[in-house]
């Protein structure tokens, strides 16, 4: 039962994270939560950074600055994949949840 619950939590978190990405950066509250998660967990996007390419409000040459290894204003524009976190947040945060929840 514990494994079923854990999988459900992960699935729910994945859906919720992707949903929040759709609102980025229009919703300031959502943006700050996602930015905090990406910066703190050193991750980018749900599965990986290319998830940001699918967000209509984000140009394909851009990821949030919080994806950058060294976060500075504007570092996510014309980014180089070598300078951003490549791991997705669902897997990264999911691992933390599995250990701690």
């Amino acid at each position: 039962a514990g494994y079923v619950f854990r999988d459900k939590v992960m699935s729910e978190f994945n859906n919720n994270f992707r949903q929040q990405m759709e609102n980025y950066p229009k919703n300031n509250h959502t943006a700050s939560i996602l930015d905090r998660m990406q910066a703190d967990f050193k991750c980018c996007g749900a599965a990986n950074y290319t998830d940001w390419e699918k967000i209509p409000s984000m140009s394909k040459n851009r990821v949030p600055d919080s994806c950058c290894i060294n976060v500075t204003v504007g570092c996510g524009i014309n980014f180089n994949e070598k300078a951003i976190h490549k791991e997705g947040c669902v897997e990264k945060i999911g691992g933390w949840l599995r250990k701690n929840v």
Epitope: S59, N61, G74, N78, F79, N80
Partner: antibody, heavy 118, light 111 residues
């Protein structure tokens, strides 16, 4: 000294294919995103495509999407542009260029290779 | 796509005078405190060469007589004092989003 040398251009019939190459030297090729830009006979510049440093991500202008394929071989320090189903509108001088991170300027360009569709 | 409109299409300036070229974007190219506008010079038979990036930063090795200004949608390239070797075509280009686009060019003639 940074050098970019394009090759592979020529005269092709409409509907034909061509593969352009851009041999580079003088910098760590695998560290940079690379672009193809073309210049029409009327001298208009048009960004065509760019590719990420690893080659894992590619981006195209709507005018060439599904028709052109950008790729790279980091072991050979070479950039490629595979062009298919060529049309007269694709007649242009094709340049490869190095894109700089963050500001997106194109700092180094090759001398270009001419593609004529006729 | 962001459309860049350059004006004038051509201009003739006397040696030692000021040349001013404008570039207007159909949408703001400024974000995060930066303006993603670049300027290039192209001489016949040569590829374009970057002069100015991020609207006002001078590319290494480019003479200080070249300067760029502007933000949002309106940008300017100034050349002062103009020298013989500045006869060329000048292009603006934005790198704010994909696709990158270029202006139609301004041909500078030295009188």
């Amino acid at each position: 000294e940074v050098k970019l040398v394009e090759s592979g251009g020529g005269l092709v019939q409409p509907g034909g294919s061509l593969k352009l190459s851009c041999a580079t030297s003088g910098f760590t090729f695998s560290d940079y995103y690379m672009s193809w830009v073309r210049q029409t006979p009327e001298k208009r510049l048009e960004w065509v495509a760019y590719i990420s440093s690893s080659g894992g991500s590619t981006y195209y202008s709507d005018t060439v999407k599904g028709q052109f394929t950008i790729s790279r071989d980091n072991a050979k320090n070479t950039l490629y542009l595979q062009m298919s189903r060529l049309k007269s509108e694709d007649t242009a001088m094709y340049y490869c260029a190095r894109r700089e991170d963050y500001d997106g300027r194109l700092t180094y360009w090759g001398q270009g290779t001419l593609v004529t569709i006729s | 796509d962001i459309v860049l409109t350059q004006s004038p299409a051509s201009l003739a300036v006397s040696l030692g005078q000021r040349a001013t070229i404008s570039c207007r974007a159909s949408k703001s190219v400024s974000t995060s405190g930066y303006s993603y506008m670049n300027w290039y010079q192209q001489k016949p038979g040569q590829p374009p060469k970057v002069l100015i990036y991020l609207a006002s930063k001078l590319e290494s090795g480019v003479p200080a007589r070249f300067s760029g200004s502007g933000s949002g949608t309106d940008f300017t390239l100034n050349i002062h004092p103009v020298e013989e070797e500045d006869a060329a075509t000048y292009y603006c280009q934005h790198s704010r989003e994909l696709p990158y686009t270029f202006g139609g060019g301004t041909k500078l003639e030295i009188k």
